[in-house]
Interface confidence: medium
């Protein structure tokens, strides 16, 4: 199986592709803002699962699915009450993933 650092690197590359592409992502669709530090990749996947018909994030969803399946989903501390653009969400996810990649633990 692929190591966690390699999967994180793959996710960083994919998210970097998305964040730098200037085309409006998923036609400006909104998703729930979630606490990534508390819920990790599983809550990110939950939030993005609500987006359909958006080819640009299919690969991200697939990578997140793999990362989430590595362990049981973490309980989110509180229900999300804010919606943000998918592009903004992806930017936050990228920052979180980079931080995890730099500092581990693996």
């Amino acid at each position: 199986s692929v190591s966690l650092p390699l999967t994180l690197k793959e996710l960083i590359e994919e998210l970097s592709n998305i964040t730098q592409d200037q085309t409006p992502l998923c036609n400006g669709s909104m998703v729930w803002s979630v606490d990534l530090a508390a819920g990790g990749f599983c809550v990110a996947l939950d939030s993005l699962t609500n987006i359909s018909n958006c080819n640009a994030i299919y690969r991200t969803q697939r990578i997140l699915h793999g990362l989430c399946n590595r362990k049981a989903p973490t309980t989110v501390s509180s229900l999300p009450d804010t919606k943000i653009e998918v592009a903004h969400f992806i930017t936050k996810l990228l920052s979180y993933t980079k931080q995890l990649f730099r500092h581990g633990p693996f």
Epitope: Q22, T23, G28
Partner: antibody, heavy 123, light 110 residues
Framework: QIQLVQSGPELKKPGESVKISCKAS????????MHWVKQAPGKGLKWMAW????????TYADDFKGRFVFSLEASASTATLQISNLKNEDTATYFC????????????????WGQGTSVTVSS | DIVLTQSPVLAVSLGQRATISCRAS??????????MHWYQQRPGHQPKLLIY???NLVSGIPARFSGSGSGTDFTLTIDPVQADDIAAYYC?????????FGGGTKLELK
């Protein structure tokens, strides 16, 4: 502060090549896409291409496929534009401009520009 | 491609209001905003972002600049016009690639 510094003016003959550089400072280079924009003398702005500074992959406008190569020297925080087989109609000022969806920037807009590099093609 | 149309020249008097228009050949809207931006280019200088997403003023840009519009019709307003506002103004759409600019409107003094 954010700065994009471009290489100096160029005078070339038709058929020659030119390489223009754009050195970025004051921000994380690989977090922001880089665009190139052409402005012919007395004319308006024309978008040429953008390059993903993380992967190095360029996306071209149709009019700038073929003789134009957009590349990176990411370790030096530098984007480059090379034009081969120069023609008279390539005479213009070429600008680099950064853009991206990173928090703190203006989504989808070119928020920092280089000073421009003048390229004159004349026999 | 989305074509953006601007009037080439606008003559104004100092202290008056200048209204610069930009019309798109198709909508530049997405669900949450209108993706039209405005740039100022003084003679011999690089363009400078003034307004992004139709009406958001860039930090450090004077409040006499404002933007409005939706769909296909957009306006940049300068009120009152000052001497250092004499420049060319370009609209640019961020709705789809290829990114396109308007032909520019040159602001001139009456």
């Amino acid at each position: 502060q954010i700065q994009l510094v471009q290489s100096g003016p160029e005078l070339k003959k038709p058929g020659e090549s030119v390489k223009i550089s754009c050195k970025a400072s004051g921000y994380t280079f690989t977090d922001y896409a880089m665009h190139w924009v052409k402005q012919a003398p007395g004319k308006g702005l024309k978008w040429m291409a953008w390059i993903n500074t993380y992967t190095g992959k360029p996306t071209y406008a149709d009019d700038f496929k073929g003789r134009f190569v957009f590349s990176l020297e990411a370790s030096a925080s530098t984007a480059t534009l090379q034009i081969s087989n120069l023609k008279n109609e390539d005479t213009a000022t070429y600008f680099c401009a950064r853009a991206g969806r990173t928090e703190g920037t203006h989504y989808y807009a070119m928020d920092a520009w280089g000073q421009g590099t003048s390229v004159t093609v004349s026999s | 491609d989305i074509v953006l149309t601007q009037s080439p020249v606008l003559a104004v008097s100092l202290g008056q209001r200048a209204t610069i228009s930009c019309r798109a050949s198709q909508s530049v809207s997405i669900s949450s905003s209108d993706l039209m931006h405005w740039y100022q280019q003084r003679p011999g200088h690089q363009p400078k972002l003034l307004i992004y997403r139709t009406s958001n003023l860039v930090s450090g840009i004077p409040a006499r600049f404002s933007g409005s519009g939706s769909g296909t019709d957009f306006t940049l307003t300068i009120d009152p016009v000052q001497a250092d506002d004499i420049a060319a103004y370009y609209c640019q759409q961020g709705r789809e690639s290829p990114w396109t600019f308007g032909g520019g409107t040159k602001l001139e003094l009456k």
